[in-house]
Protein backbone atom coordinates (compact mmCIF):
# COMPACT_ATOMS: atom_id res chain seq x y z
CA UNK A 1 0.00 0.00 0.00
CA UNK A 2 1.27 3.42 -0.95
CA UNK A 3 1.01 6.51 1.16
CA UNK A 4 -1.17 9.53 0.24
CA UNK A 5 -0.42 11.87 -2.67
CA UNK A 6 3.08 13.25 -2.60
CA UNK A 7 1.75 16.72 -3.42
CA UNK A 8 -0.17 16.87 -0.17
CA UNK A 9 2.24 18.82 2.02
CA UNK A 10 2.28 18.11 5.75
CA UNK A 11 1.19 21.59 6.75
CA UNK A 12 -1.66 21.61 4.19
CA UNK A 13 -2.88 18.17 5.12
CA UNK A 14 -5.62 17.30 7.62
CA UNK A 15 -4.65 17.56 11.26
CA UNK A 16 -2.63 14.58 12.55
CA UNK A 17 -4.74 11.71 13.77
CA UNK A 18 -4.64 11.04 17.52
CA UNK A 19 -1.92 8.56 18.42
CA UNK A 20 -1.63 6.30 21.44
CA UNK A 21 0.55 7.69 24.26
CA UNK A 22 3.76 5.94 23.20
CA UNK A 23 3.39 7.23 19.64
CA UNK A 24 3.34 10.49 17.74
CA UNK A 25 2.38 11.55 14.22
CA UNK A 26 5.19 11.49 11.66
CA UNK A 27 4.47 13.98 8.88
CA UNK A 28 7.00 12.23 6.65
CA UNK A 29 5.11 8.93 6.53
CA UNK A 30 1.73 10.42 7.53
CA UNK A 31 1.06 7.89 10.26
CA UNK A 32 1.56 7.29 13.96
CA UNK A 33 4.93 5.81 14.90
CA UNK A 34 6.78 4.93 18.09
CA UNK A 35 8.16 8.04 19.78
CA UNK A 36 10.61 8.80 22.53
CA UNK A 37 10.49 11.80 24.82
CA UNK A 38 12.31 15.05 24.26
CA UNK A 39 13.98 16.59 27.26
CA UNK A 40 15.65 19.90 27.95
CA UNK A 41 18.42 19.71 30.58
CA UNK A 42 18.29 22.09 33.51
CA UNK A 43 19.88 25.45 32.72
CA UNK A 44 23.55 25.78 33.63
CA UNK A 45 24.45 27.95 36.61
CA UNK A 46 24.80 31.69 36.03
CA UNK A 47 28.05 32.49 34.27
CA UNK A 48 28.17 29.26 32.31
CA UNK A 49 29.48 29.73 28.80
CA UNK A 50 26.55 28.34 26.82
CA UNK A 51 23.14 26.77 27.43
CA UNK A 52 22.94 23.03 27.75
CA UNK A 53 22.01 21.41 24.44
CA UNK A 54 18.56 19.96 24.05
CA UNK A 55 18.67 16.19 23.89
CA UNK A 56 16.32 13.24 23.71
CA UNK A 57 15.35 9.99 25.35
CA UNK A 58 15.27 6.85 23.20
CA UNK A 59 11.89 5.77 21.80
CA UNK A 60 10.09 3.10 23.73
CA UNK A 61 9.73 -0.26 22.05
Amino acid sequence: MRRGPRSLRGRDAPAPTPCVPAECFDLLVRHCVACGLLRTPRPKPAGASSPAPRTALQPQE
Partner: antibody, heavy 125, light 107 residues
Framework: EVQLVESGGGLVQPGGSLRLSCAAS????????IHWVRQAPGKGLEWVAW????????DYADSVKGRFTISADTSKNTAYLQMNSLRAEDTAVYYC??????????????????WGQGTLVTVSS | DIQMTQSPSSLSASVGDRVTITCRAS??????VAWYQQKPGKAPKLLIF???FLYSGVPSRFSGSGSGTDFTLTISSLQPEDFATYYC?????????FGQGTKVEIK
Protein backbone atom coordinates in the same frame (compact mmCIF):
# COMPACT_ATOMS: atom_id res chain seq x y z
CA GLU B 1 21.83 -3.30 20.91
CA VAL B 2 20.20 -1.86 17.80
CA GLN B 3 21.79 -3.13 14.61
CA LEU B 4 21.01 -3.11 10.89
CA VAL B 5 22.82 -5.47 8.53
CA GLU B 6 22.50 -5.21 4.75
CA SER B 7 23.18 -8.03 2.32
CA GLY B 8 22.54 -8.94 -1.29
CA GLY B 9 24.80 -6.51 -3.10
CA GLY B 10 27.09 -7.52 -5.91
CA LEU B 11 27.92 -7.18 -9.59
CA VAL B 12 25.03 -7.27 -12.04
CA GLN B 13 24.66 -6.49 -15.73
CA PRO B 14 22.53 -3.58 -16.96
CA GLY B 15 18.90 -4.63 -17.07
CA GLY B 16 19.46 -7.21 -14.34
CA SER B 17 17.93 -7.54 -10.89
CA LEU B 18 19.10 -7.73 -7.28
CA ARG B 19 17.32 -8.03 -3.97
CA LEU B 20 18.86 -6.30 -0.98
CA SER B 21 18.01 -7.31 2.57
CA CYS B 22 18.21 -5.26 5.77
CA ALA B 23 18.07 -7.44 8.86
CA ALA B 24 17.24 -5.54 12.04
CA SER B 25 17.95 -6.53 15.61
CA UNK B 26 17.52 -4.78 18.95
CA UNK B 27 14.19 -3.22 17.92
CA UNK B 28 11.07 -4.14 15.99
CA UNK B 29 10.83 -2.65 12.50
CA UNK B 30 7.05 -2.31 12.85
CA UNK B 31 7.57 0.58 15.28
CA UNK B 32 9.27 2.96 12.84
CA UNK B 33 9.99 3.61 9.17
CA ILE B 34 12.91 1.96 7.40
CA HIS B 35 14.75 3.80 4.63
CA TRP B 36 17.17 2.92 1.87
CA VAL B 37 19.79 5.56 1.06
CA ARG B 38 22.48 5.17 -1.57
CA GLN B 39 25.82 6.80 -2.30
CA ALA B 40 27.44 6.59 -5.71
CA PRO B 41 31.27 6.50 -5.69
CA GLY B 42 32.61 9.91 -4.71
CA LYS B 43 29.11 11.41 -4.53
CA GLY B 44 26.68 12.52 -1.85
CA LEU B 45 23.79 10.76 -0.14
CA GLU B 46 20.63 10.06 -2.14
CA TRP B 47 17.46 8.84 -0.49
CA VAL B 48 15.92 5.92 -2.39
CA ALA B 49 12.79 4.64 -0.64
CA TRP B 50 11.04 4.15 2.67
CA UNK B 51 8.57 1.67 4.08
CA UNK B 52 6.38 1.87 7.17
CA UNK B 53 6.10 -1.84 7.98
CA UNK B 54 3.18 -1.50 10.41
CA UNK B 55 0.82 -0.46 7.60
CA UNK B 56 2.80 -1.05 4.42
CA UNK B 57 3.03 2.58 3.35
CA UNK B 58 5.89 3.25 0.91
CA ASP B 59 7.45 6.03 -1.13
CA TYR B 60 10.20 6.18 -3.75
CA ALA B 61 12.63 8.61 -5.30
CA ASP B 62 11.64 9.55 -8.85
CA SER B 63 14.90 8.04 -10.10
CA VAL B 64 13.88 4.52 -9.04
CA LYS B 65 10.09 4.63 -9.22
CA GLY B 66 8.69 1.75 -11.24
CA ARG B 67 11.95 -0.18 -11.06
CA PHE B 68 12.54 -0.65 -7.33
CA THR B 69 10.16 -2.08 -4.75
CA ILE B 70 10.60 -1.71 -1.00
CA SER B 71 8.94 -4.14 1.37
CA ALA B 72 9.20 -5.53 4.87
CA ASP B 73 8.56 -8.81 6.65
CA THR B 74 7.79 -8.03 10.29
CA SER B 75 7.96 -11.71 11.23
CA LYS B 76 11.60 -11.74 10.10
CA ASN B 77 12.26 -8.16 11.26
CA THR B 78 13.75 -7.52 7.83
CA ALA B 79 13.25 -4.92 5.10
CA TYR B 80 13.97 -5.53 1.43
CA LEU B 81 14.75 -3.56 -1.69
CA GLN B 82 13.94 -5.37 -4.93
CA MET B 83 15.86 -3.67 -7.74
CA ASN B 84 14.87 -4.42 -11.32
CA SER B 85 15.94 -2.96 -14.68
CA LEU B 86 19.21 -1.87 -13.14
CA ARG B 87 21.25 0.85 -14.82
CA ALA B 88 24.87 1.91 -14.59
CA GLU B 89 23.77 5.00 -12.62
CA ASP B 90 22.37 2.73 -9.89
CA THR B 91 25.93 1.74 -8.98
CA ALA B 92 26.37 2.79 -5.35
CA VAL B 93 26.74 1.69 -1.77
CA TYR B 94 23.22 1.06 -0.46
CA TYR B 95 22.49 1.73 3.21
CA CYS B 96 19.38 0.92 5.18
CA UNK B 97 18.54 3.16 8.09
CA UNK B 98 15.95 3.49 10.83
CA UNK B 99 14.09 6.76 11.32
CA UNK B 100 13.83 7.62 15.00
CA UNK B 101 11.06 9.85 16.29
CA UNK B 102 10.72 11.97 19.41
CA UNK B 103 7.42 13.43 20.55
CA UNK B 104 7.28 17.18 20.03
CA UNK B 105 3.74 18.39 20.67
CA UNK B 106 2.36 15.17 19.30
CA UNK B 107 4.40 15.31 16.10
CA UNK B 108 7.59 13.44 15.25
CA UNK B 109 10.89 15.26 15.52
CA UNK B 110 13.54 12.89 14.24
CA UNK B 111 16.21 11.63 11.93
CA UNK B 112 17.91 8.45 10.80
CA UNK B 113 19.70 7.26 13.89
CA UNK B 114 20.91 3.75 13.06
CA TRP B 115 22.44 2.78 9.72
CA GLY B 116 23.75 -0.45 8.32
CA GLN B 117 27.32 -0.89 7.15
CA GLY B 118 26.27 -0.62 3.51
CA THR B 119 26.31 -3.06 0.63
CA LEU B 120 27.89 -2.30 -2.74
CA VAL B 121 25.85 -2.68 -5.91
CA THR B 122 27.81 -2.48 -9.16
CA VAL B 123 25.93 -2.38 -12.45
CA SER B 124 28.30 -3.02 -15.32
CA SER B 125 28.63 -5.15 -18.41
CA ASP C 1 10.29 17.87 -4.22
CA ILE C 2 12.00 20.09 -1.67
CA GLN C 3 15.59 20.96 -2.57
CA MET C 4 18.21 21.39 0.14
CA THR C 5 21.14 23.61 -0.84
CA GLN C 6 24.21 23.40 1.36
CA SER C 7 27.07 25.88 1.50
CA PRO C 8 29.94 25.86 1.27
CA SER C 9 30.58 22.64 -0.64
CA SER C 10 33.96 22.40 1.09
CA LEU C 11 35.99 24.35 3.60
CA SER C 12 39.44 24.23 5.14
CA ALA C 13 39.81 24.82 8.85
CA SER C 14 42.19 24.26 11.72
CA VAL C 15 41.71 22.46 15.02
CA GLY C 16 40.03 24.85 17.43
CA ASP C 17 38.27 26.85 14.72
CA ARG C 18 34.59 27.65 14.84
CA VAL C 19 32.93 26.18 11.74
CA THR C 20 29.52 27.06 10.34
CA ILE C 21 27.69 25.18 7.59
CA THR C 22 24.39 26.42 6.18
CA CYS C 23 21.50 24.70 4.47
CA ARG C 24 18.65 26.41 2.62
CA ALA C 25 15.36 24.70 1.78
CA SER C 26 13.44 25.52 -1.38
CA UNK C 27 10.23 25.65 0.67
CA UNK C 28 9.37 26.32 4.30
CA UNK C 29 9.92 23.17 6.34
CA UNK C 30 9.42 24.44 9.90
CA UNK C 31 12.24 22.77 11.89
CA UNK C 32 12.21 19.39 10.12
CA VAL C 33 15.94 19.24 9.46
CA ALA C 34 18.58 16.74 10.55
CA TRP C 35 22.36 16.95 10.21
CA TYR C 36 24.68 13.98 9.62
CA GLN C 37 28.42 13.42 9.71
CA GLN C 38 30.05 10.93 7.37
CA LYS C 39 33.63 9.74 7.20
CA PRO C 40 35.11 7.92 4.18
CA GLY C 41 33.95 4.33 3.90
CA LYS C 42 31.57 4.66 6.84
CA ALA C 43 27.83 5.08 7.24
CA PRO C 44 26.50 8.53 8.17
CA LYS C 45 25.94 9.40 11.84
CA LEU C 46 23.05 11.48 13.13
CA LEU C 47 24.21 14.67 14.88
CA ILE C 48 21.21 16.99 15.11
CA PHE C 49 17.49 16.49 14.54
CA UNK C 50 14.54 18.88 14.51
CA UNK C 51 17.01 21.63 13.56
CA UNK C 52 18.42 22.11 17.06
CA PHE C 53 18.20 18.94 19.14
CA LEU C 54 21.48 17.18 19.85
CA TYR C 55 21.27 13.45 19.29
CA SER C 56 22.28 11.15 22.13
CA GLY C 57 26.05 10.80 22.56
CA VAL C 58 26.97 13.65 20.22
CA PRO C 59 29.51 16.11 21.70
CA SER C 60 28.05 19.45 22.78
CA ARG C 61 30.44 21.36 20.49
CA PHE C 62 27.91 20.54 17.75
CA SER C 63 24.82 22.70 17.60
CA GLY C 64 22.07 23.45 15.15
CA SER C 65 19.73 26.35 14.60
CA GLY C 66 17.20 27.75 12.17
CA SER C 67 13.60 27.36 11.06
CA GLY C 68 11.57 27.94 7.95
CA THR C 69 14.08 27.79 5.11
CA ASP C 70 17.49 28.63 6.61
CA PHE C 71 19.41 26.27 8.86
CA THR C 72 22.89 26.20 10.38
CA LEU C 73 25.20 23.56 11.81
CA THR C 74 27.95 24.96 14.02
CA ILE C 75 31.02 23.24 15.43
CA SER C 76 32.18 25.54 18.20
CA SER C 77 35.76 24.25 18.40
CA LEU C 78 36.83 21.89 15.65
CA GLN C 79 38.50 18.69 16.82
CA PRO C 80 40.70 16.31 14.78
CA GLU C 81 37.91 13.73 14.62
CA ASP C 82 35.50 16.30 13.13
CA PHE C 83 37.16 16.36 9.72
CA ALA C 84 34.46 14.71 7.63
CA THR C 85 31.58 15.46 5.27
CA TYR C 86 28.36 16.89 6.68
CA TYR C 87 24.87 16.59 5.20
CA CYS C 88 21.56 18.23 5.99
CA UNK C 89 18.27 16.45 5.32
CA UNK C 90 14.67 17.60 5.41
CA UNK C 91 11.85 15.39 6.67
CA UNK C 92 8.89 17.75 6.53
CA UNK C 93 7.45 15.94 3.56
CA UNK C 94 8.29 12.91 1.46
CA UNK C 95 10.53 12.43 -0.38
CA UNK C 96 13.10 13.29 2.30
CA UNK C 97 15.95 15.05 0.56
CA PHE C 98 19.62 15.58 1.41
CA GLY C 99 21.85 18.54 0.80
CA GLN C 100 24.84 17.93 -1.47
CA GLY C 101 27.28 17.81 1.45
CA THR C 102 30.02 19.98 2.93
CA LYS C 103 33.51 18.52 3.20
CA VAL C 104 35.49 19.88 6.16
CA GLU C 105 39.20 19.51 5.47
CA ILE C 106 42.36 20.26 7.42
CA LYS C 107 43.92 23.61 6.58
Amino acid sequence: EVQLVESGGGLVQPGGSLRLSCAASGFTISSSSIHWVRQAPGKGLEWVAWVLPSVGFTDYADSVKGRFTISADTSKNTAYLQMNSLRAEDTAVYYCARRVCYNRLGVCAGGMDYWGQGTLVTVSS
Amino acid sequence: DIQMTQSPSSLSASVGDRVTITCRASEEIATAVAWYQQKPGKAPKLLIFAASFLYSGVPSRFSGSGSGTDFTLTISSLQPEDFATYYCQQSEVSPPTFGQGTKVEIK
